[in-house]
């Protein structure tokens, strides 16, 4: 009795879904009551399928409502673990253990990454100095630095702060501001750059024609 995996290295984006598969030999019709399936991650029990049903009482709380064994796949000889709304803490080495006559196990590694994709931006103006403050904010993992550039590719000096996200402990909240004298329709870019060549995420900020001055600061 041997379990096989067609893939044992998985990558998923934060907040996405992943289905990891272990295949086992099934002849003719599957006898669910002779099948045992365990899925674990390090010391956390995720799935315990015995006597034709899942025992949710043993499931680690961090996987509650997010992890399930796809029962229809069992009849095809696949123990498929689906995890939804993937978190950074889900990264690690998973183990599928299957008993069906014989017994075997396989390890699968899951890597979770969180690109700085949803970049929020804000442009405000100081009514006294007419200096513009440009702000970009995004969440991701690992840490990123923010590079500010102008449309003529000059690198500008901004100020970046990194805090932990409210959504998840490991996630970083990166905010960067650039103070600059700018004219209408000028274009600036903030680029969230993690160390290495893999991926950058850039937002374009266009200075508007005229920014409304906050009501409390208007002169009448």
């Amino acid at each position: 009795f041997t379990i096989t995996v067609s893939k044992d290295l998985y990558v998923v984006e934060y907040g996405g879904n992943v289905t990891m598969e272990c295949k086992f030999p099934v002849e003719k019709q599957l006898n669910l009551f002779a099948l045992i399936v365990y899925w674990e991650m390090e010391d956390k029990k995720i799935i315990q399928f015995v006597n034709g049903k899942e025992d949710l009482k043993v499931q680690h709380s961090s996987y509650s409502q997010r992890a399930q064994l796809l029962k229809d796949q069992l009849f095809l000889g696949k123990a498929a673990l689906q995890i939804t709304d993937v978190r950074l803490q889900d990264a690690g080495v998973y183990c599928c253990l299957i008993g069906y006559g014989g017994a075997d196990y396989k390890r699968i590694t899951l890597k979770v990454h969180a690109p700085y994709r949803n970049i929020s931006q804000r442009i405000s103006v100081d009514p006294v100095t007419s200096e513009h403050e440009l702000m970009c904010q995004a969440e991701g993992y690992p840490e990123a630095e923010v590079i500010w550039t102008s449309s003529d590719h000059r690198v500008l000096s901004g100020k970046t702060t990194i805090t932990n996200s409210n959504r998840e402990e490991k996630l970083f909240n990166v905010t960067s501001t650039l103070n600059i004298n700018a004219t209408a329709n000028e274009i600036f870019y903030c680029t969230f750059q993690r160390s290495g060549p893999e991926e950058n995420n850039t937002a374009e900020l266009v200075i508007p024609e005229r920014l409304p001055v906050p009501a409390s600061e208007r002169t009448h």
Partner: antibody, heavy 119, light 107 residues
């Protein structure tokens, strides 16, 4: 700028041991899985070992399991490879490698340290 | 282990030529295939990730294609700085494996 600087290579006799080190800088070391990759004299590249960002799990190819041990010290930004019972076919340039955050490939390589196993 | 076979082993071209390098996997690896360049006496560097995704800082003349078992690295109008070794690597299954390499040399 990401920098990976290997050290500890040299000439060792068959059956001997050697510990390689890699000093990392220019990135948040504790956020990335790290690997050792070697290049044999005939220029073939071979994955040697990988360790997760926190150091809680490691991977080795079957032929190196038990002889090689990868470890890391996140406080010092250092990666290590302990090699024992060395054989002549372990002769290679050993590269320290930073794995990508979005997959299992090498984003950055060190300059390498040469290990020669010979009587 | 998944075996990656690169061909040709050596490719002799003139600067300005366009070339294609092949990498074939012993089983399907979806798009989990990456390309590296290694110049003489240097460390490898990442060129293409996930079969076709470009890498910042890499010239646009380098492109990748393929899925499943057959992959291609294309260099549009080779420049003198492009000569060296090219390796493919799979990240579908542990252990990650590399192809034997293709040497791109001046004709």
């Amino acid at each position: 700028e990401v920098q990976l600087v290997e050290s500890g290579g040299g000439l060792v006799k068959p059956g001997g041991s050697l510990k390689l080190s890699c000093a990392a800088s220019g990135f948040t070391f504790s956020s990335y899985a790290m690997s050792w990759v070697r290049q044999t004299p005939d220029k073939r590249l071979e994955w040697v070992a990988t360790i997760s960002d926190g150091g809680s799990y490691t991977h080795y190819p079957d032929n190196l399991m038990g002889r090689f041990t990868i470890s890391r010290d996140n406080a010092k930004n250092n990666l290590y490879l302990q090699m024992s019972h060395l054989k002549s076919d372990d002769t290679a340039m050993y590269y320290c490698a930073r794995e990508s955050y979005d997959g299992y490939y090498v984003a950055n390589w060190g300059q390498g340290t040469l290990v020669t196993v010979s009587a | 282990d998944i075996v990656l076979t690169q061909s040709p082993a050596t490719l002799s071209v003139n600067p300005g030529d366009s070339v294609s390098l092949s990498c074939r996997a012993s089983q399907s690896i979806s798009n989990n295939l990456h390309w590296y360049q290694q110049k003489s006496h240097e460390s490898p560097r990442l060129l293409i990730k996930y079969a076709s995704q470009s890498i910042s800082g890499i010239p646009s003349r380098f492109s990748g294609s393929g899925s499943g078992t057959d992959f291609t690295l294309s260099i549009n109008s080779v420049e003198t700085e492009d000569f060296g070794m090219y390796f493919c690597q799979q990240s579908n299954s542990w252990p990650q494996t590399f192809g034997g390499g293709t040497k791109l040399e001046i004709k």
